[in-house]
Interface confidence: low
């Protein structure tokens, strides 16, 4: 920072702001008696630009001209040297460079609302580096004239604080935005135009909706505009949707009748708004209304399966499952399900409402010829209802899809495949691939899934309630008529070896043989599909190595015989259980000594 | 060496008077403008009134004009602020600031190399 000079003066010619790539000369010199003590010709003036030494002189001053000084401030500061003593401040002076304003581009002007005032905006070109002041001026009928002046270095937006009327929506204005500064100045071109070209509407407000006796085929959009209005435009959506639909109306007059919305959606509306056909801008767009249509009754027919389950010599239990609606048939909140269950013989039905379930368990006699119809019921009507004649599904052996696989296809997907049936593979009107977890105890609650394959198709992606490392008992039916045959298969996405052997929980002794029973592996613990259990024996205290019985692996069995081993000997026994990937370890160990007598 | 020393604020009640002094000292020219800016917690500092030394050209904001009065006594190189009709949103720290310049302007807070250490004024009942 510059010092009083009290000493003396620095002087800047022509101007301590100057125009980049111009000269100056600057003039240091002394104040009378204010040299060096004794030797006033041994005074040195040095000139500096910052802290940098530019230039000297023995005397009472110094003249140096310097260029090419760079945009913005430059301090010089002039500092006396006399001999035996520092160097001693005498003056300083800052020289401002920059540029004179270039014409500013782009003026536009804009009106926002008809109570609104005038504001213009506009683009300043390069900057100056100097103070800049901006002054706009706007011109109208009758000579009336605005002016506006903006005491920012950095401006380019002005407010008149007027606000023009529709009384003479034609008549001309014309704006004109002047830059100066000590270098020069600069104007636009002028921008003419009139109410219409530079009102720009306020968004409509107070935007409400209307369901004629609750349809959404009668559907009216009501809102309010600024008076001048002429037209608008009307965008909404679904609200789970990016994509807008977009209609544009003419002397709406705030209201709009919209045909084609669908039921039970919740819908995202928007409006914006313009005063004249060709001439000003659109409003921005209003804030949203978010609004749900009503409901309509359900259309598309429910998928429904069932399994049947023999019970005793004359009952038996049906289980009918059925898949949800998609939200575009269930057309609103499915209320509840009707199963209506009929002997088709004796004409005796039973209907019954569920809710909160899609699946239903009766027990029926197994004499008769049963049928099910399942419908969804919203709050305005019930679908239509899927009617199923329930029949041994997999009775018709002939109709058996042969040859059936199933193997891991990428995660949590397993593809099965199949050979149609032996019987004329024409006859077969579709198959429906099912699959449930295994469970051993065969647990009827698990839940069941299927999906339905057209009759040319031999192979089924199953995604759907796929895990990896679980085992799944997959079943293919092909359907003929009332007639169905099926095959079963077990398969997993993934797998690898079981994370621990069957539990031996009985050894007993039966005719000179013994019978191994166990428990089954825990579900999470078996990794996949068991494929063989193995039963190993060894003598105690022997270091031979052990034999082993490989049994094929079946969801019922837990048991098996051996009968090879040496009465009165004390044997070890223990269990292993293998999937396609590898074997468990170790089950727990049991002794056991036969007691017969020997040979 | 550029200086600026403001006078001390004060508490004052609302619709009453109060009058802030800058002594300025080191311009080696009369191309400057000095200017009084204000600020509230949380807020940008905001151009209140400025003055430039050669003519002694004045500024002001919207929010103070007909109330604020910026005056200067170039014999003793100070510049004055005086505020009359003073009201509780005036509460601000108000500091003098300083630039070389050829025309005048309210202009923004990072146009200014020279700064005092500003003094807080209180409007309140």
């Known amino acids: 920072k510059i010092d009083a000079c009290k000493r003396g003066d620095v002087t800047v010619k022509p101007s301590h702001v100057i125009l980049l790539g111009s000269t100056v000369n600057i003039t240091c010199s002394l104040k009378p008696r204010q040299g060096c003590f004794h030797y006033s010709r041994r005074n040195k003036l040095i000139l500096y630009k910052f802290d940098r030494r530019i230039n000297f002189h023995h005397g009472h001053s110094l003249n140096s001209q310097v260029t090419g000084l760079p945009l913005g401030t430059t301090l010089f500061v002039c500092k006396l040297a006399c001999i035996n003593s520092d160097e001693i401040q005498i003056c300083g002076a800052e020289i401002f460079v920059g540029v004179a304003p270039e014409q500013p581009q782009n003026l536009s002007c804009i009106q926002k609302g008809e109570q609104g005032t005038v504001a213009c905006t506009w683009e300043r070109g390069r900057d100056t580096h100097l103070y800049t002041e901006y002054t706009l001026q706007l011109s109208g009928p009758k000579n009336l004239t605005w002016q506006k002046q903006c005491k920012d270095i950095y401006c380019d937006y002005l407010d008149f604080g007027i606000n023009l009327t529709p009384e003479s929506p034609e008549s001309n204005f014309t704006a004109k935005v002047t830059a100066v500064n000590s270098l020069g100045s600069s104007s636009s071109l002028p921008s003419t135009f009139t109410f219409l070209d530079i009102v720009r509407p306020l968004p409509p407000w107070d935007i409400r909706i209307k369901f004629q006796k609750a349809s959404v085929s009668r559907c009216t959009l009501y809102w309010r505009d600024e008076g001048l209005v002429l037209l608008n435009r009307l965008r909404y959506r679904p609200s789970n949707s990016r994509l807008w639909n977009m209609v544009n109306v003419t002397k709406a007059k705030g209201r709009h009748d919209l045909l084609d919305l669908k039921p039970f959606t919740e819908y995202e509306f928007q409006i914006s708004s313009k005063l004249h056909l060709y001439k000003g801008s659109w409003s921005d767009w209003s804030e949203s209304l978010r609004a749900q249509t009503p409901e309509e009754e359900p259309t598309g027919m429910l998928d429904v399966w069932y399994m049947k389950r023999h019970i005793d010599y004359s009952r038996q239990q049906i289980s009918l499952f059925w898949k949800n609606l998609s939200v575009s048939e269930a057309r609103g909140k499915i209320l509840h399900y009707q199963v209506t269950l009929q002997e088709l013989t004796g004409g005796k039905a039973m209907t019954q409402n569920i809710t909160g379930h899609t699946s239903w368990t009766t027990v029926i006699p197994r004499t008769g010829n049963w049928a099910v119809a399942v419908s969804a019921a919203n709050s305005k009507g019930s679908s239509l209802p899927t009617r199923i004649n329930i029949m041994n599904l997999c009775e018709a052996g002939l109709l058996a899809p042969r040859q059936v696989s199933a193997n891991s296809e990428g995660m949590d997907n397993i593809l099965v495949t199949w050979q149609p049936p032996r019987k004329d593979p024409s006859a077969v009107q579709e198959y429906v691939v099912e699959w449930r977890e295994l469970h051993p105890g065969g647990d009827t609650q698990v839940p069941l899934n299927w999906l339905r394959s057209r009759p040319y198709n031999v192979s089924a992606l199953i995604s759907e309630n796929i895990k990896s490392y679980i085992c799944y008992e997959i079943r293919v039916y092909a359907l003929s008529g009332d007639q169905g045959g099926c095959s079963s298969i077990l398969g997993n996405s993934k797998h690898k070896a079981p994370l621990s052997g069957p539990h031996i929980n009985a050894i007993t002794e039966e005719k000179g043989s013994i019978l191994i029973s166990w428990n089954s592996i825990p579900v999470q613990e078996q990794m996949g599909c068991l494929l063989h259990y193995r039963i190993y024996w060894k003598e105690r205290d022997s270091n031979s190595q052990p034999q082993l019985c490989e049994i094929p692996y079946r969801v019922s069995q837990n048991s098996h015989p051996i009968n090879s081993l040496q009465p009165r000997v004390t044997y070890v026994l223990w269990m292993t259980a293998l999937t396609a990937a590898g074997e468990s370890s170790h089950g727990n160990e049991r002794e056991f000594c036969l007691q017969g007598k020997a040979n | 060496e550029v200086q600026l020393v403001e006078s001390r604020g004060g508490l004052v009640q609302p619709g009453g008077s109060l009058r802030l002094s800058c002594a300025v000292s080191?311009?080696?020219?009369?191309?400057?403008?000095i200017a009084w800016f204000r600020q509230t917690p949380g807020h940008e500092r905001e151009g209140v009134s400025s003055?430039?030394?050669?003519?002694?050209?004045?500024y002001y904001a919207d929010s103070v004009k007909g109330r604020f009065s910026i005056s200067r006594d170039n014999a003793k190189n100070m510049v004055y602020l005086q505020m009359n009709s003073l009201k509780p949103e005036d509460t601000a720290v108000y500091t003098c600031?300083?630039?070389?310049?050829?025309?005048?302007?309210?202009?923004?807070?990072?146009?200014?190399?020279?700064w005092g250490q500003g003094t807080q004024v209180t409007v309140s009942s």
């Open positions: 080191g311009f080696t020219s009369d191309y400057y403008v």
């Open positions: 003055i430039r030394k050669g003519d002694g050209a004045t």
């Open positions: 600031a300083a630039r070389y310049d050829t025309l005048l302007g309210g202009g923004r807070p990072r146009e200014f190399p020279y």
